[in-house]
């Protein structure tokens, strides 16, 4: 027999997703035990019939990738856990309605810093996700978001930041002193979507100047 | 050299159609994004829409939606603007232009596209 | 939509003059700004990105400066040449919006 309260065995049904990557995540419930199973399911919103997920029956483990089935930028999805216990008892939790533009959070970029003598450049990496154009390719982020743009900031002291931002991926912080060390932090921003990657940083230090010994 | 090349202009009556096109060449067309621009007579500029050539996102200005439609020909390195329910207000020089390395830094010529009965 | 206001509409400058033209958006719009001229009968040429750096072979008389919400265009000393209408545009969200342009003419 089902339980009084679905949460005695599922609970926290959500998608987590990060770069276009979609992971569907789950809790057991309080009544959850080590060998309850979990199925997971999936449709696209407007569309009346579940889809079953496969891989992902009468599975052990609190996760299950969607990313594939959820990989159309422009649908809503919703899905569901059906977890069913040693005894029997079953229960089903719903996703809310899922939208990976909405939803999906920002990884830091990938940036390679390079010291010069009087300058700190960075230039930064488009970030590929997992969902394929119709020629095969990969998209990458910047394919995606019309709107992103990087934002740059060299912290020179305690009190001074340089910034610099931009839709470019190479940039350069003139004007420092030799043989000096810097941190760095860029970001990713889409302001359309309120989106802001956690930063990456770099700490680097300026070459010596050579010119004078 | 960036090369961007408008056609398709011309005087069409208010509720008529109209498709632009836009030849490129010179830069990775197919991994773009390309947009249209008008600039209507003795007026400013204006933003049109926006396409993406890899993932094919759009985007439109409000005034424009539903009656026009941006898209590419990505293996002839075209872009098009399909315009229907012409206006007169529509009535405007159409520029293409692409964002390479970041900036909205190349432009075409321009085509003319008069709406008048 | 972010709405850009340009100012002046219009002026007249003596060859050799500093010549100022401003830009306000309507919200911040971090550094997300450009600054093109346009020439009559020709398409815009972008003068400055990220609201201060100069494009790669445009005159050192050209420059620009501001974040947030408020922008700058100097013209250090007017050329000939640089008759003609200058537009701002926000390059932060879609729709990108131009300001109203600023026609710089001969005194």
């Known amino acids: 027999h089902a339980p009084e309260d679905p949460s005695d065995l599922l609970q926290h049904v959500k998608f987590q997703s990060s770069n276009f990557e979609n992971i569907l995540t789950w809790d057991s419930g309080p009544e959850g035990t080590p060998d309850t199973v979990y199925s997971i399911e999936y449709k696209t919103y407007g569309e009346r019939d579940w889809v079953a997920k496969k891989g992902c029956q009468r599975i052990t483990r609190k996760s299950c990738n969607l990313t594939v089935e959820t990989g159309n930028l422009t649908e809503l999805y919703y899905a569901r856990v059906t977890a069913v216990s040693a005894g029997g008892r079953s229960a089903t939790k719903m996703t809310d309605r899922f939208s990976s533009l909405q939803h999906t959070t920002l990884k830091p970029p990938d940036v390679t810093c390079i010291s010069k003598v009087r300058s700190i450049q960075m230039i930064v990496h488009p970030t590929p996700t997992p969902i394929r154009a119709g020629d095969g390719h990969r998209l990458t982020l910047e394919d995606i978001f019309h709107d992103l743009f990087y934002h740059l900031e060299l912290q020179v002291n305690r009190t001074y930041q340089m910034h610099l931002g931009g839709k470019q991926r190479e940039y350069e912080f003139f004007g420092l002193t030799p043989d000096t060390e810097f941190l760095g932090t860029i970001m990713i921003c889409v302001p359309t979507w309120a989106k802001e990657s956690a930063p990456y940083m770099c700490r680097v230090k300026t070459l010596p100047d050579r010119t004078w010994t | 050299e960036v090369q961007l090349v408008e056609s398709g202009g011309g005087l069409v009556q208010p509720g008529g159609s109209l498709r632009l096109s836009c030849a490129a060449s010179?830069?990775?067309?197919?991994?773009?994004?390309m947009y249209w621009v008008r600039q209507a007579p003795g007026k400013g500029l204006e933003f049109v829409s926006v396409?993406?050539?890899?993932?094919?996102?759009?985007h439109y200005v409000e005034s424009v939606k539903g009656r026009f439609t941006i898209s590419t020909d990505n293996a002839k390195n075209t872009l098009f603007l399909q315009m229907n329910s012409l206006k007169s207000e529509d009535t405007a020089v159409y520029y293409c232009?692409?964002?390479?390395?970041?900036?909205?830094?190349?432009w075409g010529q321009g085509t003319q596209v008069t709406v008048s009965s | 939509d972010i709405q850009m206001t340009q100012s002046p509409s219009s002026l007249s400058a003596s060859l050799g003059d500093r010549v100022t033209i401003t830009c306000q958006a309507s919200?911040?719009?971090?550094?997300?700004l450009a600054w093109y001229q346009q020439k009559p009968g020709q398409a815009p040429k972008l003068l400055i990105y990220?609201?201060?750096r100069l494009q790669t072979g445009v005159p050192s008389r050209f420059s620009g400066s501001g974040s947030g919400t408020s922008f700058t265009l100097t013209i250090s000393g007017v050329e000939a040449e640089d008759l003609a209408t200058y537009y701002c545009?926000?390059?932060?969200?879609?729709?990108?919006?131009f300001g109203q342009g600023t026609k710089v003419e001969l005194k």
């Open positions: 232009a692409t964002r390479i390395q970041g900036l909205i830094d190349y």
């Open positions: 010179g830069f990775t067309f197919s991994s773009s994004w």
């Open positions: 396409i993406n050539t890899r993932s094919g996102i759009t």
């Open positions: 919200q911040s719009i971090s550094s997300q």
């Open positions: 990220g609201a201060s």
């Open positions: 545009l926000q390059d932060y969200s879609w729709p990108l919006t």
